[in-house]
Amino acid sequence: LEVSESPGSVQVARGQTAVLPCAFSTSAALLNLNVIWMVIPLSNANQPEQVILYQGGQMFDGALRFHGRVGFTGTMPATNVSIFINNTQLSDTGTYQCLVNNLPDRGGRNIGVTGLTVLVPPSAPQCQIQGSQDLGSDVILLCSSEEGIPRPTYLWEKLDNTLKLPPTATQDQVQGTVTIRNISALSSGLYQCVASNAIGTSTCLLDLQVISPQPRSV
């Protein structure tokens, strides 16, 4: 018995269906086929869980969280023992193993390993201003999404016809910050932060109002 090499990893957007491949070749009839799918969750590597089991011509549910979401892609018994997982959740991310036995066929590699990564688009980011908005001050524009896998990058733009940040601004696309030094009236206006990753984007807008000192009455 020999389990074929798997592609290594599968990526899927949260809520979509993941197909985890596993196929084998055997010299024996599929009368005593036994297939166990296990997962080592990324969030808890010390707690492997059973995903689904095929034994004695019957299918059995694995861990409770997979109930109603998992099944074999084809009619069993078969040499293709790939599974699907519907409505994928972040907690489904992990290393999946298919363990195949088909007595009396022994020897060979009977385990296939596939990684599953559930991707999450950036959630609506929060735009905030840190620091005094008084003329001549330094301010930091902050942007961050609570969710996003892979981790989002952040791009700030000023929503005027140049789409450029003020000349005194420096941007950190990883942290999601823009530092504007010595703010002037020209720094005032509407700024857009775009949070983006491999599967999506999300934005927030920020209104920067530079406060000019009131002329003192004599």
Epitope: P121, P122, G200
Partner: antibody, heavy 123, light 110 residues
């Protein structure tokens, strides 16, 4: 409560420049946080955002119209204006001025709006 | 062609509940908030619902908004004759870096 009122010619010849003015009353156009906008509505169709101006003079235009649009502000008169060059029959529409503000939102809204003025492009 | 898609017309009888849908994409409704405007005959649009589901002061609680995925909807319960108007959805589009509207839905009260 801020009110807006559009004014300008209702008929413009093709290839000429459409010019409209919006007068703001009940508040100052120089109030921070308000972006003075133009929006148009083609006959029997949806709305299209044209662009905005901030009291400082900073402008931002719809990329699809950017090459033909100029928005300006006159804070002393509490007015802002729209110029749309090289007009064709496709620019026939009701033109609205509106105030956009962010409020506590992530993306803001348009409120209030002027009554709108119909501009027909025809020879 | 409007960026956001609305049905051109909707209708209902007084007292009924009607919903108006607004369909967009991941770059607008999918990732940004939605506003709704009411345009009574011969008047300018008026803000009806802001930020997906917030009613500005003065808007009756018969009007409500919701958003799911890349679609939004406006619900009107206890339909009244004065609700006969055009309704527009609006969102911000991250790809266009600008504000986009639906084509409008004409609501008729039968």
């Amino acid at each position: 409560q801020v009110q807006l009122q559009e004014s300008g010619p209702g008929l413009v010849k093709p290839s000429q420049t459409l010019s409209l003015t919006c007068t703001v009353s009940g508040g100052s156009i120089s109030s921070g946080g308000y972006y003075w906008s133009w929006i148009r509505q083609h006959p029997g169709k949806g709305l299209e955002w044209i662009g905005y101006i901030y009291y400082s003079g900073s402008t931002y235009y719809n990329p699809s119209l950017k090459s033909r649009v100029t928005i300006s502000v006159d804070t002393s008169k509490n007015q802002f204006s729209l110029k749309l060059s090289s007009v064709t029959a496709a620019d026939t529409a009701v033109y609205y001025c509106a105030s956009w503000s962010l409020g506590t939102s992530n993306h803001g809204w348009f409120d209030p709006w002027g009554q709108g003025t119909l501009v027909t492009v025809s020879s | 062609q409007s960026v956001l898609t609305q049905p051109p017309s909707a209708s209902g009888t007084p007292g009924q509940r009607v919903t108006i849908s607004c369909s967009g994409s991941s770059s607008n409704i999918g990732s940004n908030t939605v506003n709704w405007y009411q345009q009574l005959p011969g008047t300018a649009p008026k803000l009806l619902i802001s930020d997906n589901n917030n009613r500005p002061s003065g808007v009756p609680d018969r009007f409500s908004g919701s958003k799911s995925g890349t679609s939004a909807s406006l619900a009107i319960t206890g339909l009244q004759a004065e609700d006969e108007a055009d309704y527009y959805c609006q969102s911000y589009d991250s790809n266009l870096s600008g504000w986009v509207f639906g084509g409008g839905t004409k609501l008729t009260v039968l």
